[in-house]
Amino acid sequence: AYRPSETLCGGELVDTLQFVCGDRGFYFSRPASRVSRRSRGIVEECCFRSCDLALLETYCATPAKSERDVSTPPTVLPDNFPRYPVGKFFQYDTWKQSTQRLRR
């Protein structure tokens, strides 16, 4: 079956996360919960099944420094992932289109 338009993947996913989370930064995977030993990452959640803004926001880093696990910096990138200069991210119109698509 063809993937629904609500899926996000590749650079579009990274850009949309950057837009949604802003200065907070974000994680590509959340720590596994006590209930589930397996950590499901943003790619599994958004590339291969439908994804919404609420779900994306759960991958944002916690705003307050005191609440964040300081041992793991925000925007945790996988091995061999290109490090993007922050200045390259500002494509507001593109992100706006992606987030509007997710709101529908």
Partner: antibody, heavy 120, light 107 residues
Framework: EVQLLESGGGLVQPGGSLRLSCAAS????????MDWVRQAPGKGLEWVSV????????IYADSVKGRFTISRDNSKNTLYLQMNSLRAEDTAMYYC?????????????WGQGTMVTVSS | DIQMTQSPSSLSASVGDRVTITCRAS??????LNWYQQRPGKAPRILIY???TLQSGVPSRFSGSGSGTDFTLTISSVQPEDFATYYC?????????FGGGTKVEIK
């Protein structure tokens, strides 16, 4: 040394099947998503499919959807491409490639390719 | 799908020449644009990723620039081993797509 080695190509009749393999070495295979990219003789590059690091997610080009299946065995460090209902237009050199494509990254390691010829 | 258009499709250059190849995306892709070199009978190899980042081990005579829809690969002083075909590729969204290629030949 980081290396990808494809095998399984050959001559097959239209409508036939073939299974390609890609053996990975020199890196932690289970941490990377993997892709297949093909190149018809004298033509450009065409992305075929990607599989997530765990093997739980896949995406295909429209041209192969429903006919090709990408899979992996992380315990064997091997990537596969099962090709069914082959057509003449599937004739190409098939490359496996490592990349961070699901995160917007590039193909940083390529295999040497395996040739698939579909002809009667 | 995002279409990638490369130009020129081929060009002739002499050793030492400055060569510029352009790539245009059918819609904005931020800087998610990669460049590959392919020599005859060989697999492609990555040169530049995210528009301007030089892959480790690639000579500094290669450079990339651009953002949005328009991108450029420049070889500041072409060397004999640079005569090959070059492809751009977007990694902004799936399906991933490549440009048609630019063949750089010896004049």
């Amino acid at each position: 040394e980081v290396q990808l080695l494809e095998s399984g190509g050959g001559l097959v009749q239209p409508g036939g099947s073939l299974r390609l393999s890609c053996a990975a070495s020199g890196f932690t295979f289970s941490k990377y998503e993997m892709d297949w990219v093909r190149q018809a003789p004298g033509k450009g590059l065409e992305w075929v499919s990607v599989i997530s690091s765990s093997g739980g997610g896949t995406i295909y080009a429209d041209s192969v959807k429903g006919r090709f299946t990408i899979s992996r065995d992380n315990s064997k460090n091997t990537l596969y491409l099962q090709m069914n209902s082959l057509r003449a237009e599937d004739t190409a050199m098939y490359y496996c490639a490592r990349g961070r494509t699901l995160y917007g990254g590039a193909f940083d390691i390529w295999g040497q390719g395996t040739m698939v010829t579909v002809s009667s | 799908d995002i279409q990638m258009t490369q130009s020129p499709s081929s060009l002739s250059a002499s050793v030492g020449d400055r060569v510029t190849i352009t790539c245009r995306a059918s819609q904005p892709i931020n800087t998610y644009l990669n460049w590959y070199q392919q020599r005859p009978g060989k697999a492609p190899r990555i040169l530049i990723y995210t528009s301007s980042t030089l892959q480790s081990g690639v000579p500094s005579r290669f450079s990339g620039s651009g953002s949005g829809t328009d991108f450029t690969l420049t070889i500041s002083s072409v060397q004999p081993e640079d005569f090959a075909t070059y492809y751009c590729q977007q990694s902004y969204s799936f399906p991933l797509t490549f440009g048609g290629g630019t063949k750089v030949e010896i004049k």
